[in-house]
Each structure stands twice: as structure tokens, then as C-alpha cells.
């Protein structure tokens, strides 16, 4: 029987700036039963504060809710372990909620092709930035990338669309039934999940183009 | 505890390219942005570029653009440099270090920093 | 890019000293500078980050002060072992820059 390892924080994570979440990794046991408790403090701050929240994230998490969030400000946290033999600590882990970001997926992907007379035919696919995200106040701005593929196909074909909410694709397969999806992220943060796929059927009368895709 | 683990001196030819490896061990290598830093002898630190191991997803400093590829490997919680085209210019110290938290790039662990030479 | 200026490249001091390091921006930053502290033949040590934030370890007669654009470090009863090169860094806006270093040394 032993005190535990060390802790580790590994992850945290916001839908939105307005509240995060952290998980941490147990170390060893040391065999005997372990009580986790995190604390933190504010940069500039010298009063330790304990996790306001234990249940919302799941096992070995903390949830700090919007009361608690504050940005622009780090977060210095560590996990301590104890159990009857001693207590071991985390490193500490600073955080600053503007860079833990991770947005829920783009909403309303339309995907349509458009065959104008004058031109060749293309793919032009639009999408909505995720509700949670304010970008009028100008604390975000939002990247996002596109994957398609055959429907058929085994590997995805990727373009980054930068600030856009619309990107157009010249080079497809006629007569071949596409999946579209697009996900985000903040210019610092975490990708999103990819949108969930959208279906595209190309005409068989569809024109290949030398020229790969072109944004707006 | 933490370390960042970099080979001490690679020589190169001109014109020739070059991978530097920063092995990170003590955390979890996805947790924390990795960066490189350049220092010329006797001269000061300039920035590189930064890669987010998690995804892979990178920035660079305009100037080194098209000398410098950031990449990693996961599975070993390896960080990649590699250097191409390279010319006396190009010798220096180069050091990998850890982002300082989920935050602002400040860096709180370096590697000891690869020497490279660049000479026929 | 935002430039960082060391303008002492060199300082002469004494152990028991209380020395200012200066460091100027080319625009604002507001508090987004971190000083490291680097030893011959070592790799760069994080002193200070957010303008005036003691990193884990560091002692308490390494003190920074500024935001903005004009920022101090001060080392208060300068010991031997603080005879290196210290650089600042600003990561207020891509890409993060350094100043060029001032080197303390004994008078």
C-alpha cells in the first residue's frame, strides 16, 4: 500500500467561452481509495478556490459554470490525490479559456450543383456558423475546412475555406453520389466534430475541370 | 517530470534538407502545443512556428514559410522540424519548446537544442 | 511584426545589485510579454509571463513591471547565479518575437 501517483490535468474544454470543462488522468492507486479535489486560482490572485463543479463533466472532471468563467484571465489549477499513505499533486496547469474552444459542428449544409450556361459546372455549398458562437462581438473568428468523398470511396478529399461560409469545388466525378461535411474552429482552439454528411448526387452530364476548386 | 529530448548537432550539406526530432516525455504530448525557436550563435531567439500535436494543425512565421515543415507522430509523442534547402544561413541552435499552458504562447519547457551545421 | 528592443545589449553589475532590464515594443501588447533567463551553453528558462506572473520556481527577486508597450525587469539583490542573458517576448500578435537579449555581467 502506497500514497498515489501523480495526477495529471490532460484536457479542457469550452463549447463557447461562457463555461469549460477539465478532465484529469489518475496516476496509480497506490491500492487503497483516492479522493480527487481541484483547485485554482486567477492569475494575480493569491486566494485558492476548489472545483465549483465535480458531477457535470463526468469522472475525474471539474465544470466550471458561467459564474465562474472569466475571460481573458488564466487559470492556474492542480489536482490533488490522496488516500491513507500520503497525497500526491499535479503540475500545475494554466489555462485561458480563449484558447480552449471547441465549437459544436457548422449548422444548415446545403450542398447544390450549379451549371451555368456561360461556364462550367461546379459544386457551391454553403453552411451556417454554430448557434453557440457569437462572432459579432469579434472575440471569435471561425476557420473552417470541407471533406468530400465518392460515396463509395475510402479517402476523404479536404479544403480549407478560412473565414468563408461558402466555398465552390470545379473537379468531381460525374454521376457519382458525393458525402459533404464541414466542421470549424476558433483561430486558437479545436477543431469541431464534422457536420453530420450531406448527400450530392453529380450528373452524369457534369463537365470535369482542370482546375481543382476556387473560393470566393 | 518533464523533458523534451533533441539530438545534439546534425551537420548538413548546402542545398541538402534536414528532420529535426523533440521527443517529449513527462505529460501528455497532445496536451500542448509544441513550438521552434531559432538562435544563431551569439544572436537572439526568433519564433518558427507552432503545431498543436492533437491535430496537427500549425502556424508558421512568414519568414521561414518555405523553410520550415512542422509535423508530429503521435504514437511516439514526437515532434518533427524539417528544414530544407539550407545554406550557412541556416546554421544555428535550434530548440523545441512546450507551450506553457492551454494559453497565450509563452514557453515553459525547452529541449537542450540541435546544433546545426551547414557546411560542404 | 511587432519588434521588441533590448536597448542595453550589455549591463555591468554587482552580487547584491538591484538591476533593471528594459524592453520596448513596437506597438502596443498590453500585458503579452514573457522574460527567460538564459545561462551559456543552456537552453532559454521561463522567468515571467503576462507582463508580471513569477512562473512555478522562479524566485521573488525577479519582479516585472509595464503594459503596454514599456516593460521592466528587475532583479532585486542580484546574485552570481543570475549572471546570463535575458530576452523578452511578446505574444500579443503573430509572429511571437523576441527582443535581442542583454547580457548582465560582473563589473
Known amino acids: 500500500q502506497l500514497p498515489p501517483g501523480k495526477p495529471e490535468i490532460f484536457k479542457c474544454r469550452s463549447p463557447n467561452k461562457e463555461t469549460f470543462t477539465c478532465w484529469w488522468r489518475p496516476g496509480t492507486d497506490g491500492g487503497l481509495p483516492t479522493n480527487y479535489s481541484l483547485t485554482y486560482h486567477r492569475e494575480g490572485e493569491t486566494l485558492m478556490h476548489e472545483c465549483p463543479d465535480y458531477i457535470t463533466g463526468g469522472p475525474n472532471s471539474c465544470h466550471f459554470g458561467k459564474q465562474y468563467t472569466s475571460m481573458w484571465r488564466t487559470y492556474v489549477m492542480m489536482v490533488n490525490a490522496t488516500n491513507q499513505m500520503g497525497s500526491s499533486f499535479s503540475d500545475e496547469l494554466y489555462v485561458d479559456v480563449t484558447y480552449i474552444v471547441q465549437p459544436d459542428p457548422p449548422l444548415e449544409l446545403t450542398v447544390e450543383v450549379k451549371q451555368p450556361e456561360d461556364r462550367k459546372p461546379y459544386l457551391w455549398m454553403k453552411w451556417s456558423p454554430p448557434t453557440l458562437i457569437d462572432l459579432k462581438t469579434g472575440w471569435f473568428t471561425l476557420l473552417y475546412e470541407i471533406r468530400l468523398k465518392p460515396e463509395k470511396a475510402a479517402e476523404w478529399e479536404t479544403h480549407f475555406a478560412g473565414q468563408q461560409t461558402e466555398f465552390k469545388i470545379l473537379s468531381l466525378h460525374p454521376g457519382q453520389k458525393y458525402l459533404v461535411q464541414v466542421r470549424c474552429k476558433p483561430d486558437h482552439g479545436y477543431w469541431s466534430a464534422w457536420s453530420p454528411a450531406t448527400f450530392i448526387q453529380i450528373p452524369s452530364d457534369f463537365i470535369m475541370n482542370d482546375h481543382h476548386h476556387h473560393h470566393h | 517530470q518533464v523533458q523534451l529530448q533533441q539530438p545534439g548537432a546534425e551537420l548538413v550539406m548546402p542545398g541538402s534538407s534536414v528532420k529535426l526530432s523533440c521527443k517529449a516525455s513527462?505529460?501528455?504530448?497532445?496536451?500542448?502545443?509544441m513550438h521552434w525557436v531559432k538562435q544563431r550563435p551569439g544572436q537572439g531567439l526568433e519564433w518558427i512556428g507552432e503545431?498543436?500535436?492533437?491535430?496537427?494543425?500549425?502556424n508558421y512565421n512568414q519568414k521561414f514559410k518555405d523553410k520550415a515543415t512542422l509535423t508530429v507522430d503521435k504514437s511516439s509523442s514526437t515532434a518533427y522540424m524539417q528544414l530544407s534547402s539550407l545554406t550557412s544561413e541556416d546554421s544555428a541552435v535550434y530548440y523545441c519548446?512546450?507551450?506553457?499552458?492551454?494559453?497565450?504562447?509563452?514557453?515553459?519547457?525547452w529541449g537542450q537544442g540541435t546544433l546545426v551545421t551547414v557546411s560542404a | 511584426d511587432i519588434v521588441m528592443t533590448q536597448s542595453q545589449k550589455f549591463m555591468s553589475t554587482t552580487v547584491g545589485d538591484r538591476v533593471s532590464i528594459t524592453c520596448k515594443a513596437s506597438?502596443?501588447?498590453?500585458?503579452?510579454v514573457a522574460w527567460y533567463q538564459q545561462k551559456p551553453g543552456q537552453s532559454p528558462k521561463l522567468l515571467i509571463y503576462?507582463?508580471?506572473n513569477r512562473y512555478t520556481g522562479v524566485p521573488d527577486r525577479f519582479t516585472d513591471s509595464g503594459s503596454g508597450t514599456d516593460f521592466t525587469l528587475t532583479i532585486s539583490n542580484l546574485q552570481s547565479e543570475d549572471l546570463a542573458d535575458y530576452f523578452c517576448?511578446?505574444?500579443?500578435?503573430?509572429?511571437?518575437?523576441f527582443g535581442g537579449g542583454t547580457k548582465l555581467e560582473i563589473k
Open positions: 503545431i498543436d500535436p492533437s491535430d496537427s494543425y500549425s
Open positions: 506597438q502596443y501588447v498590453g500585458t503579452a
Open positions: 513527462g505529460y501528455t504530448f497532445t496536451t500542448y502545443w
Open positions: 519548446a512546450r507551450n506553457g499552458g492551454l494559453g497565450p504562447a509563452w514557453f515553459s519547457y
Open positions: 503576462s507582463a508580471s
Open positions: 517576448q511578446q505574444y500579443s500578435s503573430y509572429p511571437w518575437t
